[in-house]
Structure formats: C-alpha cells, structure tokens
Interface confidence: medium
C-alpha cells in the first residue's frame, strides 16, 4: 500500500508480487519524487484500492500503455 509520509508526497516502499489483470485496473500515477526511496507506479483498481508496482516490470509497463490507450480521446 502507498504511504503518505508528508502530504502531498506519497511513496511506495514495497511492490506487489502479483500481476494485476488490466481488467481490474482503473488508472495509475507515477511516483518520481526525490523524497521517495524508489520510483514507483501506483495503480488504482476498480475496487478503489491503490497498489504499488515496480515500473521496471514488463506487466506494469504494458498495463500503463493499456490504460493510456483507454484514456486517449478517439480521433474523429
């Protein structure tokens, strides 16, 4: 779970060790603050839970790509 040390900075100290299906993901945000010990991705799931994930893992990158495509406005 992400941990807010000093609002508004949220950091991740541990990453999930389970792949989350993209069908269970609603959105994500990147954690790049120098105040945090490591770079991270926080996924928000469809049941409103927030999960820390390692941005170096392929499934995390693929999931971010998938969510990016979902949120892009269709070109007309």
């Amino acid at each position: 779970q992400p941990d807010a040390i000093n609002a508004p900075v949220t950091c991740c100290y541990n990453f999930t060790n389970r792949k989350i299906s993209v069908q269970r993901l609603a959105s994500y945000r990147r954690i790049t603050s120098s105040k945090c010990p490591k770079e991270a991705v926080i996924f928000k799931t469809i049941v409103a839970k927030e999960i820390c994930a390692d941005p170096k893992q392929k499934w995390v990158q693929d999931s971010m790509d998938h969510l990016d495509k979902q949120t892009q406005t269709p070109k007309t």
Partner: antibody, heavy 119, light 108 residues
C-alpha cells in the same frame, strides 16, 4: 486468522424465501468481497453471485438473476444471501467465501448452510 | 459465460502415484486467473492453487498448477492418503465466475 461463520440449517416450503448470513472475523471486512456458492446433494460447485462492499459492486449469475439478493452490513461484518421463490431444486449446501477484490480466488470459506426445500 | 470442462471425471490411483487433472476453458482465461480447490466429503472446499500456478498458504509442495489461456493442469506428484477427494477448477477473471464440474480422485 480469518473465519466465516454461517447461520444454521433451514427447512423451507416451496415458494418461500431463505436468508443465509455469513459473519466474518479476523480481517478487514470492507477490503474484501464475498461470493456465494452452492452445492446440491452429490453435485458440483455452482457460483451464485458476489458482493464487494468497498466498491459497492454486486454481481449475479444469470440463472439466479431476479431471485437472489446479496447484501452486506459493514457495521457487523456480515454478508447475506437471500433466495426467493424456492423450489425443490434449490435444496443444497450454500457456502460463503471471501475473495480479494483485486484478484478473486476464494481463499476462506464458511462451513456451509444446508437449505432443504420440501413441502 | 466461460465453461470449464474438467477431465477425467474420475481418476482411480494408488497412494504414491502421480495424478494429473485437466481443466479446459471455453475461452481464454486472461492473466491465468484460475484456481484449484480440494473438497472432502462433508467439508467446505479448500483453496490449493491460485493464478494457475501459485500455491496457497500451507499447501504441500506435491501440489502444482500449470497452464495458461484455455488449458490448465493440476498435478499431485505423489498421492498421499489424504489427497483422495474431489478437485474443482474456478475462473475468476470474468463475471459470472464459473467452476468446472469436478474430478474425483479415488483409491484404486
């Protein structure tokens, strides 16, 4: 340790309703979902539906749509399954089981409640 | 709905033998969101394997799961007397969740 304790056995008349409860202890109730699964005598497992209190989602199998209602009371960490218009084919053991809303495997199960529908 | 078909319906084996149970899905189970349960008479099912291949807490190493897409396997490397039971597969990626019809592992 997580424990799910279900209400006791019921004998019901055809056409009536039954409400089975499932009280959870040893975990954060609102962070998990509860599925209901039934098993007719000598038969396999049949998924009926699920509720995820955190998200407010409820899902039902088409077969039970309109006859089953799954609810949850976070204040008492209890989930309920009500099945109406009972018929003899509804005679079964009804189980509640916990799942993590992000994933979905059923990691803890209640002991089961036998519902007998007989005239 | 995803239909899960388990085979064989019954497996007659002796203690110490290897058991291989199959579960085939009518469509792909995305991200291998498939579980295996063991059920003994008069008891509730018990989770053995989740995400197709991860052992649940406290499950002996003789139980292993494999597979992806539409074909999944539960293997019991060497049957112990307490392993004779009914085994069910379960997909939890789509609603409605569905179970296979079960495979009974009985003593030969």
């Amino acid at each position: 340790q997580v424990e799910l304790v279900q209400s006791g056995a019921e004998v019901k008349k055809p056409g009536s309703s039954v409400k089975v409860s499932c009280k959870a202890s040893g975990g954060t109730f609102s962070s998990y979902g509860i599925s209901w699964v039934r098993q007719a005598p000598g038969q396999g497992l049949e998924w009926m539906g699920a509720i995820n209190p955190l998200a407010g989602h409820t899902h039902y199998a088409q077969k039970f749509q309109g006859r089953v209602t799954i609810t949850a009371d976070e204040s008492t960490s209890t989930a309920y399954m009500e099945l109406s218009s009972l018929r003899s084919e509804d005679t079964a053991v009804y189980y509640c089981a916990r799942y993590d809303g992000i994933y979905g495997e059923l990691d803890f199960w209640g002991q089961g409640t036998l519902v007998t529908v007989s005239s | 709905d995803i239909v899960l078909t388990q085979s064989p319906a019954t497996l007659s084996l002796s203690p110490g033998e290897r058991a291989t149970l199959s579960c085939r899905a009518s469509q792909s189970v995305s991200d291998a969101y498939l579980a295996w349960y063991q059920q003994k008479p008069g008891q509730a099912p018990r989770l053995l394997i989740y995400d197709a291949s991860s052992r649940a807490t406290g499950v002996p190493a003789r139980f292993s799961g494999s597979g992806s897409g539409t074909d999944f396997t539960l293997t019991i490397s060497s049957l112990e007397p307490e392993d004779f039971a009914v085994y069910y597969c379960h997909q939890y990626i789509f609603y409605p969740n569905t179970f296979g019809q079960g495979t009974k592992v009985e003593i030969k």
